[in-house]
Structures are given as structure tokens and as C-alpha cells.
């Protein structure tokens, strides 16, 4: 089996260009192509990989939603030479373009990192933006978090940094097959430095310390933060919105995917993508966008632009 | 039917400026890469310069970068290169061509620009 | 110098197949990445004539076919015509230079 091979950090990666094909492992016989795209208040941007997988063929889109940060999640897998470029990976641009100064700021400050490289999303060095309320929605907290793709053998992972509407959530994710977008909430102007190490002790109840008796020399006892997961099963339908339920992560368990897609934990990938040749050096994030008149789901099915004749 | 009408070319002394349009119909504008590609008289293709379809991810041929700028506007279903400091070696006719599946597949008619002094 | 190697001319006579070569290197065709043919007809511009390494846009004859192996690919045209006269471009992308690059050029003169 013959597939086509790319891989997307809010690059142009996977561009018309870029492709390459690659011949897969014995006992492949799935090319896959999995996209996922992140919008904030203040733009989007995708991940993407193209190559040999492994599983049925299928299709899954998925809509999530994490306090106002909304990702669309597409796999498509085939059993043909070269079919995996179906999925339009390429993001809408705005017509016109998105006008962020119609838009009150509601006080809230955040750094924003949409498409960014995790160098340059670092600490204090990414942009800072203003919060505004959109669609009916407060954002008046500031995330710091992951999108995290996996397909053809190969993870891609992005920072994700932005206003959200929840200023406490803690470790919290949403996720699709292969497709997972977490991170932790904060209250304050750019609290969102780096949330990595955020506890889910909230700051205004201060943490319960067990210090150990001051005579004898007993072990230490550690005070132990255990927190619930809420599984959530997939619906049916091949497309939903998805959202988390608590404070702590709500995750899609691997086990309970839609059926027409791989099982993630079940069967590894294999085959792999080859790496994309360099990175966009010269521009920015592909795609990189402001919400104001977006399309809700920009990307969501489509085609590429077909050669003469397609393909 | 898919057209692309390139026009801006002519006569310029080293060291110049100019600027070519490429105007595109026939096909969802905003949703295609573009790119320049000129070619030196009885010589063969270079690439110039692409831009992706939202006009955030620009690349440059090391011969032209710091020089050429490339932009689109997709309201106006317009792809441009402004070409700033001329040099001889850039005389050439310049093509805008449409980025489709992975290839150049619609190419202009194609604009001459004369850098002599 | 180009970065993709083809050979300056090539012939053939009417009803006779002809082959064009094109030589790239682990950082284009060797990288994985697909080749693509252009045609240019005397005083025109390029028209695509194949593209990801073996496909044919429509209107393309099917005299016209590609291949790739390795760091290289071929253009094969069977059953050549007066009208097949032209010059002929290879082109991939390349990861050293950050785009795409094109061969050389072949010049095909169908002779008689």
C-alpha cells in the first residue's frame, strides 16, 4: 500500500507542495489522514497528518468544546493507494478579513498562542491579547494547555493559550480518537504563563497540610489529591459536540469510540508519516484567523481543490 | 473555466520597482495557493514565491527574498508581487500559477518584465 | 544549474515512444516527495501533464505516462506526434530550499 505523508504543526506542512507518498509495512493496509483544528476568540490554527495507518477504514468529525475553546477533530482512513487526501486541511480565510476592534475588551488580559511553536510559546514572550465577550459568552479567563494529535505513527503537539471562560478549571481536556485538547483555567492579567504544575486546590480555599507529629518519628503522611475522571461515551452520530461536564478532565474512553473508527489503545499505528521538510520559517500559522465571522467549523468536510480531472 | 490574467509587466532600469496582478476567476480564489514563476528568456522555470490560501504562510526563492513581496486579496480575487531593487537577472516573464492537488495546475498566459539600463 | 537533472533535447520520429529523464537528489524526489511533468508548447505557457508522479489531469492522452524510483522519475510518450513538440519540465519540491524546484528542461523534436 501506497499513502500520501505529511505532518501539520500549524505550518504549511501538509500543503499541496509538501506531499509525499510513502510505501507502507507489510500488513498495513490503511492510508489515514487525521486533522484537528483549535479556534480561540482571537484566531485558529490546525494540526494534520497524512500517512500509513492501521485499523478499518472509516470516517469520524468530531465538535468539542473546553470553556469556549472549540476544536474539530476529522480522521479518515481508506484501503486504496494514495486515498488519504481527502479531508481539506487547508483553513477558510476570512472575507473579509476579521475586524477584533469591534469588540469590547471586558478587562481581561491573557498571552495568546495560536499556532505558535512551543519556543515561541514560552513563559512571557507570546502575545498578549484583550478578552472580549463573544456569541453571548464571557471570557474572562486566561488557558494555558495542549492540542495533541496522533496518526500514522507520529504525535503532534501544539501550545494552546488564550481566553476562555472559565478562570479555575484544572487539568482539564476533551478528547476524539487520537485528539486531545487540555489544559488548566486562571484568573488574573496574564496568569497564563504556565499552568503545567496548577493544582486542584483553588485559590481561595487554601490547601489542607498534614504536618507529621512533632515528637516522634513516625513516616510522613502525604496528603493525596485523587480526582474522578467523568467518562463520557461517544455518541452514535459521527459528529457531536463535545463537552466537559466538571471541573476536573472529561475524556472520551478509547474503549468507547465510535466503531467506525480505530480503536486508539486497541491497535497501534504503524507504517508512520515522513516529517515534513522544514517548517514555515517565513509566515505564520496556516490558516491563522480571528473568530469575529468565522464559519463555526471551518474545514469541516470539504475536498481539496482537485487537480484538472481530480485524482 | 479557470482563468488567471496576469498584467503590471514592462520596461524598468536596475534597481526599480513594479508590481504584477493576477487576476484570478473560474474557481474559489480564497481557497487556493498561488504562486509566481517566471521564466528568463529561452531559459527554463523558477519558482518565485507562494502564499497560502488565508495569505498567512509566504515563501520566498532565496534569489528574490528581502526583494519581492507577495500578497492576495481575496475580496478582489487578486494575487500581486511587488518586485523593489530590479536587477538585470530578474528580466523574465512571470506566470501566476494555481497550487492544486500538489501541483501547479492552471498557469497564467504569463507578464514580461525587462530590468536594462 | 537546475536541481533536478533532465537532458537538454530529446527526439523521436511520429508513431515512436520517447523517454525523458529526471535526477533529483535525498532532499526532492528521494525525500518522497511527488513529481510533477509540465508541457510548454513554442510561445505558451506551461499546461500541467502529470502530476503526483503517474496521474494524468483530464484532457492529458493517456500516451502521455510518469514514473518514479528512487531519487528519480521518467516521462514516457508512446506513439509520438508532430504536435508533441515542445519543451518538457520535471518538478518536486525540495526541502533544502524551502519550494519547489524544476529540471532543466528537455527540448523534444519530432523528427521527419
Known amino acids: 500500500l501506497e499513502c500520501y505523508s505529511c505532518v501539520q504543526k500549524a505550518d504549511d506542512g501538509c500543503s499541496p507542495h509538501r506531499m509525499k507518498t510513502v510505501k507502507c509495512g507489510p500488513g498495513v493496509d490503511v492510508c489515514t489522514e487525521a486533522v484537528g483544528a483549535v479556534e480561540t476568540i482571537h484566531g485558529q490554527f490546525s494540526v494534520a497528518v497524512r500517512g500509513c495507518g492501521s485499523g478499518i477504514p472509516g470516517k469520524n468529525d468530531r465538535g468539542l468544546d473546553l470553556h469556549g475553546l472549540l476544536a474539530f477533530f476529522q480522521l479518515q482512513q481508506c484501503s486504496e493507494d494514495r486515498c488519504n487526501a481527502k479531508l481539506n486541511l487547508t483553513l477558510r480565510g476570512l472575507n473579509p478579513a476579521g475586524n477584533e476592534s469591534a469588540y469590547e475588551p471586558n478587562g481581561a488580559e491573557c498571552y495568546s498562542c495560536v499556532g505558535l511553536s512551543r519556543e515561541k510559546c514560552q513563559g512571557s514572550m507570546p502575545p498578549v491579547v484583550n478578552c472580549y465577550n463573544a456569541s453571548g459568552r464571557v471570557y474572562k479567563g486566561c488557558f494555558d494547555g495542549n492540542v495533541t494529535l496522533t496518526a500514522a505513527n507520529v504525535t503532534v503537539s501544539l501550545p494552546v493559550r488564550g481566553c476562555v471562560q472559565d478562570e479555575t478549571c484544572t487539568r482539564d481536556g476533551v478528547t476524539g480518537p487520537g485528539f486531545t485538547l487540555s489544559g488548566s483555567c486562571c484568573q488574573g492579567p496574564r496568569c497564563n504563563a504556565d499552568l503545567r504544575n496548577k493544582t486542584y486546590f483553588s485559590p481561595r480555599i487554601p490547601p489542607l497540610v498534614l504536618l507529621p507529629p512533632p515528637t516522634t518519628a513516625a513516616p510522613s503522611t502525604r496528603a493525596q489529591n485523587s480526582s474522578s475522571t467523568t467518562s463520557t461515551a461517544a455518541p452514535t452520530t459521527t459528529t457531536s459536540i463535545i463537552k466537559p461536564t466538571t471541573a476536573q478532565a472529561s475524556h472520551t474512553s478509547p474503549h468507547e469510540m465510535d466503531l467506525e473508527v480505530i480503536q486508539e489503545e486497541g491497535a497501534s499505528l504503524s507504517g508512520g508519516a515522513a516529517g515534513h521538510g522544514g517548517t514555515a520559517g517565513h509566515g505564520g500559522a496556516a490558516g491563522h484567523q480571528d473568530r469575529s465571522n468565522m464559519e463555526k467549523y471551518p474545514g469541516k468536510g470539504g475536498a481539496q481543490i482537485p487537480a484538472k480531472g481530480g485524482s | 473555466e479557470v482563468q488567471l490574467l496576469e498584467s503590471g509587466g514592462g520596461l524598468v532600469q536596475p534597481g526599480g520597482s513594479l508590481r504584477l496582478s493576477c487576476a484570478a476567476s473560474?474557481?474559489?480564489?480564497?481557497?487556493?495557493?498561488m504562486s509566481w514563476v517566471r521564466q528568463a528568456p529561452g531559459k527554463g522555470l523558477e519558482w518565485v514565491s507562494y502564499i497560502s490560501s488565508s495569505g498567512s504562510t509566504i515563501y520566498y526563492a532565496d534569489s528574490v527574498k528581502g526583494r519581492f513581496t507577495i500578497s492576495r486579496d481575496n475580496s478582489k480575487n487578486t494575487l500581486y508581487l511587488q518586485m523593489n531593487s530590479l536587477r538585470a537577472e530578474d528580466t523574465a516573464v512571470y506566470y501566476c500559477a494555481r497550487e492544486g492537488l500538489w501541483a501547479f495546475d492552471y498557469w497564467g498566459q504569463g507578464t514580461l518584465v525587462t530590468v536594462t539600463s | 544549474q537546475s536541481v533536478l537533472t533532465q537532458p537538454p533535447s530529446a527526439s523521436g520520429t511520429p508513431g515512436q515512444r520517447v523517454t525523458i529523464s529526471c535526477t533529483g537528489s535525498s532532499s526532492n524526489i528521494g525525500a518522497g516527495y511527488v513529481v510533477h511533468w509540465y508541457q510548454q508548447l513554442p510561445g505558451t505557457a506551461p499546461k500541467l501533464l502529470i502530476y503526483d508522479n503517474n496521474k494524468r489531469p483530464s484532457g492529458v492522452p493517456d500516451r502521455f505516462s510518469g514514473s518514479k524510483s528512487g531519487t528519480s522519475a521518467s516521462l514516457a510518450i508512446s506513439g509520438l506526434r508532430s504536435e508533441d513538440e515542445a519543451d518538457y519540465y520535471c518538478a518536486a519540491f525540495d526541502d533544502r530550499l524551502n519550494g519547489p524546484v524544476f529540471g532543466g528542461g528537455t527540448k523534444l523534436t519530432v523528427l521527419g
Open positions: 473560474g474557481f474559489t480564489f480564497s481557497n487556493a495557493w
